[in-house]
Amino acid sequence: SPGQGTQSENSCTHFPGNLPNMLRDLRDAFSRVKTFFQMKDQLDNLLLKESLLEDFKGYLGCQALSEMIQFYLEEVMPQAENQDPDIKAHVNSLGENLKTLRLRLRRCHRFLPCENKSKAVEQVKNAFNKLQEKGIYKAMSEFDIFINYIEAYMTMKIRN
Amino acid sequence: SPGQGTQSENSCTHFPGNLPNMLRDLRDAFSRVKTFFQMKDQLDNLLLKESLLEDFKGYLGCQALSEMIQFYLEEVMPQAENQDPDIKAHVNSLGENLKTLRLRLRRCHRFLPCENKSKAVEQVKNAFNKLQEKGIYKAMSEFDIFINYIEAYMTMKIRN
């Protein structure tokens, strides 16, 4: 909706300026549990190796970041909360900060494009469903247009 | 594995040259069912509007193309095959051509990056699982590294 569009645009306008604050909030939240977990980590080898940083900076950056946020929120933190009653609230707070960051990244589409759906595709699917049987004929009859669009996409990728 | 890497690199090296052939194969396959479906399509308005082409060319291009290929393969073509026994094999052949194109696009990662998984993330998850309870401490103790990586990703996005 136009309202959402405006909200999204506003998010993008102010987002770079908010970045240091959001990262500071994350670091502050982590500082409350840092000692607890780092004291218990006796292993010298890194889990988050530099190859992960390279993926974050490469063409798979969005997927890598999206997957890692999901990994921390769904796998790591729920288990981390149960390690000690004293740190449960702090881990929970850290998770909330991470969720807030993801929400802001999603709102400003260019930051997490891989988590956004194409509106045009949604419109095609909706129109197709409304047309019922006629939709099959229409979609198939326009397959040559689809091929042209694929060609445009691939030509653009080759040029880039 | 190294083998896969080489295959992927070879796909990318030869891919641009193969593009016209793949599109020609798609167009040839479509030509065998084109008349059947276009005769039955009585509607004047387009289903695949230019807004879809714009999405293909924009930052959501990969998702849009990926979703549209899936849409044709999973929703449109299975129903299109059942419209007439005489065209079933031709629609099936068109689907196979589309699957081949998708496979080649996937192999050369830069063409469909949104469908590829980050190897580094996979390695993190595997290492985490192997470490069992120690993995929780390790993943949480390295959350500051994760914040730094997020910062690097976002800084790169702002600069781009």
């Epitope: 670091r27 982590f30 006796q42 010298d44 190796k49 530099e50 940083l53 | 500051d144 690097a152």
Partner: antibody, heavy 117, light 112 residues
Amino acid sequence: EVQLVESGGGLVQPGGSLRLSCAASGFSFATYGVHWVRQSPGKGLEWLGVIWRGGSTDYSAAFMSRLTISKDNSKNTVYLQMNSLRAEDTAVYFCAKQAYGHYMDYWGQGTSVTVSS
Amino acid sequence: DVLMTQSPLSLPVTLGQPASISCRSSQNIVHSNGNTYLEWFQQRPGQSPRLLIYKVSNRFSGVPDRFSGSGSGTDFTLKISRVEAEDVGVYYCFQGSHVPWTFGGGTKVEIK
């Protein structure tokens, strides 16, 4: 290959300040901490301070009031700022990478600072 | 601050013979996480320091196996089983368990 390169050394007036840089290649300061260590002519090694991967710092008490260590992850560079220099600060200043197991595994070649009028 | 005291100050050795350097800390250097962060560095003439041993007894990658570390609590030792010409230089012990981190005064190894 891991490499650390210090720069910014030279002649400084007593009472002046210095800003040294430590540029890295082969690894990222987003993942590892960096230490500063100095060596006065003919003397031993003296630990000055560290900037951890998360950006927090620890300093030797002897230098706390006039030493600041900072970093720019995007440039993969760490900085050492020292104020109120005196002749005793004449030394070769080294930066060293913090390995994951709490030790300094790779060192730069050092940059020489002379405090003299 | 934790004071690290090395002995001897100078160690003249014969090529092919063993050498031993002692390092004593003014207090226990077991970190609160249970690890003992005691390292040994070698500094050849005109070069930067080079890590030899970390966490008391672990040899760093590329370090010859003639170098070994041992000890616990406050007393630590670096041993060279057979001294070679390239081993000439100053050796420093270092503790990274308690801030501020501190070096020993150094032991100069020279060939007799």
